[in-house]
Every structure is written in structure tokens, then in C-alpha cells.
């Protein structure tokens, strides 16, 4: 959490933001909220973007003011207008691209006065794996399967049954790379699996965390995952 | 769930003062725009004016300068308003209502003001 | 200070009517308009914001419209609940301003 203030005194309103992270090729949002003011046509939301020469995205007077905008940006960013008046400046980017990560900066003006607050953007792939019993292998062996990750992640086999234990024996795992020629498919497999137990396939780089269990008895087999996005801090 | 919850009618003589109380729950009292709106019987609706709980801030609609008067106790998350020097045309109901997702989105139940002597 | 007049300033209707209400403000106010309902006795209560969107709840037979200075509220399929008064509201300069209401009478 960033918090960021204006310049001086009661000429000072308080920016917050949200360092995240934005998925290739999706919808992205860029977290900022500040003090509401309900001098609606009084507040100026300026979004910059640090090496950047042109503007992300101004809003004015209640309506978007896109003529300074970088070329980099156009078509591809929204605030939230309707939720303006009640101090979210959020910005919305259209899909993402990996040139986007960088140090974004919210400035707002209004009738009260200034602020502004820097954001971290990091920009990646990152998905939800899944992970399968492998009914083709001569073994008992299980596959974990995430469609796009970028940086390339690590993947960790874990078991409930034997906490601790270390898997890269007796699992392989490879990267291929998509077709857009950024984003890599994980497939993770792991051999040797007892039944009743619990396995989680965990992969992981500098931006998300995602996990896929799996526990496999004689009458059935659950699944559950979860992804988490690493390094939300406020400021 | 959003409430705002007002004081009871009042019956105030010409010339007196009134205070009257909105107490809010089910959001962060400090952090919103906290509005009065009147409505004279069988009229529409005026805005009187805004207090920011968190500042103190407070915005009057000019009409209603040095008639009303705005505070809040955050403590208690509630907002007071004041009116001074009462005529018969302050005869109204007086309604808070807040900016937390959007303008106007909660209403408290109204103070019924009747000045008379 | 923004002026906004609302009409008809009353109307009649029957169920399962449809019926529009506009408002028209001095000046363009960017879609920065919402649309409340009041039964009597009752505070009002919020319908439309920001022109379009429906406030939590709302029957989808409400639906809000406009742009500029010129704005409506349009229900369609009229049901027994929707006979009240209706007001605009526009928050885009200050200080807001209400319409003058609209009285929704049954036929």
C-alpha cells in the first residue's frame, strides 16, 4: 500500500494505491482511490507512467481528456466514471502487454487540493493449474498442467502424507512455449504416487502462486486450487 | 447494511434553535461525504450542504449559509445539523444521506422540523 | 448554479403503460445524473445513477437514458409499486440540484 499526499497543509489530500499485477493478454486494473470531493467537475485524475512521454489517461471536468495521451496506451484504458465522486481513480487496461510493467504514478487535483502516489506494475503470465491422475503411464503417476506462465516458474510437488519430503526425484517437468512466443504451458509430473494421500503441485514466479491438489483414493479422486497474486502492497 | 438512522420530529418555536442527528453503520463513517437534503410538504427537493467526517470538511449550498450548521462526531459515527434563528419556512423534513458508492445512494428516515408558536 | 427542469411535473398512467420522464439541465452535465423514487412519507430512494445503471435491486422495466443537458427515465410495464414521485438529481456542478418531481399517478 502506497499512501501518497499533496504538497503542503490543507492543500494536501491523501492517494492510495495498490502495487498489482496485470496477466498478458487480459483486462488489467491499475488500483488507486483518494479522497472524495462532491465537486464532481472540480477533480482531475492524471495517470503517468515513468519513462513514458505522453500521458496513460487524464479524466476532466467529468469526462476522459485523451489528447495527450501516449500513443502506447490508446484505445486500451478507462477509469471508472461512475465512481469518481466517491474517490476511486482506478484505471482499467485493456490487454495487457509485458511492455506495460513499470512505475505508474495516480495524480489527482481537487477543489481540496492535491496528491499523488507511485504504483509498481508487474506484468506476466500466470493460470490456474490442474492436476490429473495419468491413467497412460506405467505407473502411478500424476500431471500438472497450467496453460500460460511467464517469467518461467519453479514447480514444487508436495504430500500431506509425507510433509517435507523432496519430489524432484521422482518428477519431471517441462516448459513449452505458446504460440504467441512469451507465455510458456508448465506440465509437471510427478511418479510414484500412493493412494490416500494428498498431493499439491505448486508453481510459482516473482508475480503469482498457484496451487493444484489433488487427493486420490480408492473410491475418488478431489481436486482444488487456488492462485495468489504476490507482492499487493499499498501505498 | 447501510443505515442511517435520524432523531425523532421536533417542535421548535420561531427564532430557536434546533439540532438534530443522523447516525450511520454498516460502512466507515470517517471516509464519506455525509449530505442534508430539505423537503418542504407537498415540494421538492433542496440540498443544504455536506460535512467530510474524516476532515471536518463541510460544503454549504448558499441558500443555507449561516442557517445551517454541520458537524459530525466520528467516535460515534454520527452527523448534526444545526439550524439557527428558525422561521416558518424551515417547516420541513430534513433528510441525511450519504455519497458512499454513489451520490444520494442511503437515505435516513427523515426529522420532521415544525416551527411554530 | 445548475437548474434542472423536470416534466411532466404530474402525469396519469395505466398498468402495464409505458411512460417518460425527462429532465433538462442548463448546461451539458456529463452524464452525471441520477434518478430517485418517493413513496409518501417515505424518504427517496435510489433508482439510476450516472444516467444508465440500474441501482441495486431496481426492477429491470426502469432504465435511464441521455446525455449532454438532456436526460429521461423511462418505465415500461408500469406496475402498482410504481406509482410515486420521481426526482432528478445532477451532482456534476456545484452545488447539486434536484428537478422539480414528478408526480406518477394511477389512471
Known amino acids: 500500500l502506497i499512501i501518497g499526499f499533496g504538497i503542503s497543509g490543507r492543500h494536501s489530500i491523501t492517494v492510495t494505491t495498490v502495487a498489482s499485477a496485470g496477466n498478458i493478454g487480459e483486462d488489467g486494473i491499475l488500483s488507486c482511490t483518494f479522497e472524495p470531493d462532491i465537486k464532481l467537475s472540480d477533480i482531475v485524475i492524471q495517470w503517468l507512467k515513468e519513462g513514458v512521454l505522453g500521458l496513460v489517461h487524464e479524466f476532466k471536468e467529468g469526462k476522459d481528456e485523451l489528447s495527450e495521451q501516449d500513443e502506447m496506451f490508446r484505445g486500451r484504458t478507462a477509469v471508472f466514471a461512475d465512481q469518481v465522486i466517491v474517490g476511486n481513480a482506478s484505471l482499467r487496461l485493456k490487454n495487457v502487454q509485458l511492455t506495460d510493467a513499470g512505475t505508474y504514478k495516480c495524480y489527482i487535483i481537487t477543489s481540496k487540493g492535491k496528491g499523488n502516489a507511485n504504483l509498481e506494475y508487474k506484468t506476466g503470465a500466470f493460470s490456474m493449474p490442474e492436476v490429473n491422475v495419468d491413467y497412460n503411464a506405467s505407473s502411478e503417476t500424476l500431471r500438472c498442467e497450467a496453460p500460460r506462465w511467464f517469467p518461467q516458474p519453479t514447480v514444487v510437488w508436495a504430500s500431506q502424507v509425507d510433509q517435507g519430503a523432496n519430489f524432484s526425484e521422482v518428477s519431471n517437468t517441462s516448459f513449452e512455449l505458446n504460440s504467441e512466443n512469451v507465455t510458456m504451458k508448465v506440465v509437471s509430473v510427478l511418479y510414484n504416487v500412493t493412494i490416500n494421500n494428498t498431493y499439491s503441485c505448486m508453481i510459482e514466479n516473482d508475480i503469482a502462486k498457484a496451487t493444484g491438489d489433488i487427493k486420490v483414493t480408492e473410491s475418488e479422486i478431489k481436486r482444488r486450487s487456488h492462485l495468489q497474486l504476490l507482492n499487493s502492497k499499498a501505498s | 447494511e447501510v443505515q442511517l438512522q435520524q432523531s425523532g420530529t421536533v417542535l421548535a418555536r420561531p427564532g430557536a434553535s434546533v439540532k438534530m442527528s443522523c447516525k450511520a453503520s454498516?460502512?466507515?463513517?470517517?471516509?464519506?461525504?455525509m449530505h442534508w437534503v430539505k423537503q418542504r410538504p407537498g415540494q421538492g427537493l433542496e440540498w443544504i450542504g455536506a460535512?467530510?467526517?474524516?476532515?471536518?470538511?463541510?460544503s454549504y449550498n448558499q441558500k443555507f449559509q449561516g442557517k445551517a450548521k454541520l458537524t459530525a462526531v466520528t467516535s460515534a459515527s454520527t452527523a448534526f445539523m444545526e439550524l439557527t434563528s428558525l422561521t416558518n419556512e424551515d417547516s420541513a423534513v430534513y433528510y441525511c444521506?450519504?455519497?458512499?458508492?454513489?451520490?444520494?445512494?442511503?437515505w435516513g428516515q427523515g426529522t420532521t422540523l415544525t416551527v411554530s408558536s | 448554479e445548475i437548474q434542472m427542469t423536470q416534466s411532466p411535473s404530474s402525469m396519469s398512467a395505466s398498468l402495464g403503460d409505458t411512460i417518460t420522464i425527462t429532465c433538462q439541465a442548463t448546461?451539458?452535465?456529463?452524464?452525471?445524473l441520477n434518478w430517485y423514487q418517493q413513496k409518501p412519507g417515505k424518504p427517496p430512494s435510489f433508482l439510476i445513477y450516472?444516467?444508465?445503471q440500474l441501482a441495486e435491486g431496481v426492477p429491470s422495466r426502469f432504465s435511464g437514458s441521455g446525455s449532454g443537458s438532456d436526460y429521461s427515465l423511462t418505465i415500461s410495464n408500469l406496475d402498482s409499486e410504481d406509482f410515486a414521485d420521481y426526482y432528478c438529481?445532477?451532482?456534476?456542478?456545484?452545488?447539486?440540484?434536484f428537478g422539480g418531481g414528478t408526480k406518477l399517478e394511477i389512471k
Open positions: 448546461q451539458d452535465i456529463v452524464k452525471s
Open positions: 438529481l445532477q451532482f456534476y456542478e456545484f452545488p447539486p440540484t
Open positions: 450516472y444516467t444508465t
Open positions: 444521506t450519504s455519497t458512499w458508492t454513489h451520490y444520494f445512494d442511503y
Open positions: 460535512i467530510y467526517p474524516g476532515k471536518s470538511d463541510t
Open positions: 454498516g460502512y466507515t463513517f470517517s471516509s464519506y461525504w
